[in-house]
């Protein structure tokens, strides 16, 4: 349903914000990040940017928990005005708001190159699995703001970007265990050569470059102060976070591909996958690891690296075609990415006009399928799910802001890769 223009609002991490409203985002596992300001713009896009701190003219500037920028002692607000942020208690230890720490034993399926990063924010503990970079030194050292050890001199994960950097919204709060899929970590302060700006993005061929594995995906788990338990589901000895889906593993049957379970806070909800009665081909085939039969041949060739249960489903979620058009003229590139939906029956076209690497304009058009068919230059590039499209649009809102003020070369291409659906390494959803 269309939002009436008099009621435009922004959605950010499942919350509604009014046009003009400003806030600091919650970014797991850091919690409330005071050094990032977000604003809801008139067209319903969320724009987040890093706070620029002025130079302070004193020898010992003071850091205040709820303020981003350091201040000179004589310019501090009076003590009675101070915002008192709630502390957190975890495993018998009290942590102050904003404090980072390492936890053990939260994730049963933690890989050897992963560690559990936690932070205290406004009384809640946020923990995530962080994939650590491969270390190339004999004696790595611990650093205060990361559970990963680093080689001395390496740039560890930090909020200290160059001034004015725009930070992308971590678009998908519903964390998944296919760790390297479609999530944005805060970029490292010093990027390795060739490291994608969207570390979670896959290449078109579905290959994950080694350099990309360094920046792992953070999986959210919220531990409420009162209840002392994680918002996780445990199934067959594996821990799944809220919103994550999997096929159950039953002793007598092994992995049941035709049942899809989802973790809803701490309760697992399972439903049967319904296969189509009719297929677009004469002899659909059963494939190991897939619930529904699939049509052999063309589809796989057209869309490499993708695996659908049938014509329109991926891991139990409906897929929709994505089209792309790139037009270059007079040093200006117009790139259009279009998603065709059934409900409502329309095509959402995202139009980017880029000149010399600077985004001239970005907007979204909604047109009927009939009208879309008459537009030239579009070609089918992939099929995607609504949840991946949501990640795409949220990332897009960020880079539309970022690329309008500085040169962007590959940001949009990298973001488009989010739409490509991949099998996870073991072939399961």
């Amino acid at each position: 349903e269309q939002v009436k223009h008099s009621e435009t609002y922004c959605m950010f991490q499942d919350k509604k914000y009014r046009v003009g409203e400003r806030w600091h985002p919650y970014l797991e596992p850091y919690g409330l990040v005071y050094c990032v300001n977000c604003i809801c713009s008139e067209n319903g896009n969320v724009l987040c940017s890093r706070v620029r701190c002025p130079n302070v003219h004193c020898l010992s500037p003071v850091h205040i928990p709820h303020l981003c920028c350091p201040r000179c002692p004589d310019s501090l607000p009076p003590v009675n005005n101070k915002v008192t942020s709630k502390s957190c208690e975890y495993n018998g230890t009290t942590y102050q708001h904003g404090e980072l720490f390492v936890a053990e034993g939260l994730f049963q399926n933690r890989q050897p190159n992963q560690c559990t990063q936690c932070s205290c924010s406004e009384g809640n503990v946020y923990c995530g699995l962080k994939t650590c970079p491969k270390l190339t030194c004999a004696f790595p050292v611990s650093v205060p703001d990361s559970c990963c050890r680093v080689c001395r001199g390496d740039g560890e994960l930090s909020w200290e970007h160059s001034d004015g950097d725009i930070f992308r919204q971590p678009a998908n709060r519903e964390a998944r265990h296919s760790y390297h899929r479609s999530h944005y970590d805060p970029p490292p302060s010093r990027q390795a050569g060739g490291l994608s700006r969207f570390p979670g993005a896959r290449s078109h061929r579905g290959a994950l470059m080694d350099s990309q594995q360094a920046s792992g995906t953070i999986v959210q788990i919220v531990i409420n102060n009162k209840h002392k338990h994680g918002q996780v589901c445990v199934s067959n000895g594996k821990t799944y976070s809220h919103g994550e889906s999997w096929h159950p593993n039953l002793r007598a049957f092994g992995i049941v591909e035709c049942v899809l379970c989802t973790c809803n806070v701490t309760k697992q909800e399972c439903k049967k996958i319904h296969c189509p009665n009719r297929y677009p081909c004469k002899y659909p085939q059963k494939i190991d690891g897939k619930c529904c039969k699939v049509c052999p041949g063309k589809k796989a060739k057209e869309l490499p690296g993708q695996s659908f249960d049938n014509k329109g489903y991926f891991c139990g979620e409906e897929t929709m075609p994505v089209y792309e058009s790139v037009f270059m003229e007079d040093g200006e590139t117009t790139r259009k990415i279009a998603l065709e939906t059934e409900r409502p029956p329309q095509v959402e076209v995202h139009v980017w006009t880029i000149r010399k690497g600077i985004l001239q304009h970005f907007h979204i058009e909604k047109i009927s399928k009939r009208m879309f068919e008459e537009l030239p230059h579009f070609k089918l590039v992939t099929r995607t799910t609504l949840s991946q499209w949501k990640i795409f649009t949220e990332g897009e809102a960020q880079i539309s802001q970022m690329c309008s003020s500085r040169v962007c070369r590959t940001e949009l291409e990298d973001l488009v890769k989010v739409l490509y659906l991949e099998r996870s390494e073991k072939g399961h959803c």
């Epitope: 067209n43 117009t334 006009t353 304009h361 058009e365 047109i367 009927s368 008459e374």
Partner: antibody
């Protein structure tokens, strides 16, 4: 704010041609389709065609295919419509219209004031 | 081409009355219908887009409804300043087409 500026009137001879202009301001010109619409006295609106200023992609109403030619000049953020072989049937008000805030490509939410074309000998 | 048929051609209403304007499409156009208001000697103004979405700044006495082939513009309590021609248009397919318009007179 968004504005589409059109000249007020043109008086022309039958058989001649005219190039109507529409200067856009207040938004990024290359972003939104520019439509052209014809309105004759005591008659409804007729869509002539539209042009995407970013890549000059055009769509015409078949009825106006040989009558109208749509172009743009990105450097001056101006859209043009050339009308050829004018007859009295071409006497009308011609509007340029763009959509900016409606998000539906065919909803024209900004209109020029219209150029009144009179073809008379 | 898709033909948009508006009815009635004209109507005269008193201030405060409820007005219902009809627009029928010759084929299914989904919800790709817009309504425009054109006051004498002025350019058209967008009132409703996507069949039911009120455009920015349009008073809430104007409501659009319908889908597929039948569309309605309702003015819940007509005002003197609503004297105008009302056009419906489809953007489901090229060429875009408009209805012939309904002239609303206020007594």
């Amino acid at each position: 704010q968004v504005q589409l500026q059109q000249p007020g009137a043109e008086l022309l001879r039958p058989g001649s041609s005219v190039k109507l202009s529409c200067k856009a301001s207040g938004y990024t010109f290359t972003t939104y389709w520019m439509h052209w619409v014809k309105q004759r006295p005591i008659q409804g609106l007729e869509w002539i065609g539209n042009i995407d200023p970013s890549d000059s992609e055009t769509h015409y109403n078949q009825k106006f295919k040989d009558k109208a030619t749509l172009t743009v000049d990105k450097s001056s953020s101006t859209a043009y419509m050339q009308l050829s072989s004018l007859t009295s049937e071409d006497s009308a008000v011609y509007y340029c219209a763009s959509y900016y805030g409606s998000s539906y490509v065919g909803s024209m939410d900004y209109w020029g004031q219209g150029t009144s074309v009179t073809v008379s000998s | 081409n898709i033909v948009m048929t508006q009815s009635p051609k004209s109507m005269s209403m008193s201030v405060g009355e409820r007005v219902t304007l009809s627009c029928k499409a010759s084929e299914n156009v989904g919800t790709f219908v817009s309504w425009y208001q054109q006051k004498p000697e002025q350019s058209p103004k967008l009132l409703i887009y996507g069949a039911s979405n009120r455009y920015t700044g349009v008073p809430d006495r104007f409501t659009g409804s319908g889908s597929a082939t039948d569309f309605t513009l309702t003015i819940s309590s007509v005002q003197a300043e609503d004297l105008a021609d009302y056009h419906c248009g489809q953007s489901y397919s090229f060429p875009l087409t408009f209805g012939a318009g309904t002239k609303l007179e206020v007594k």
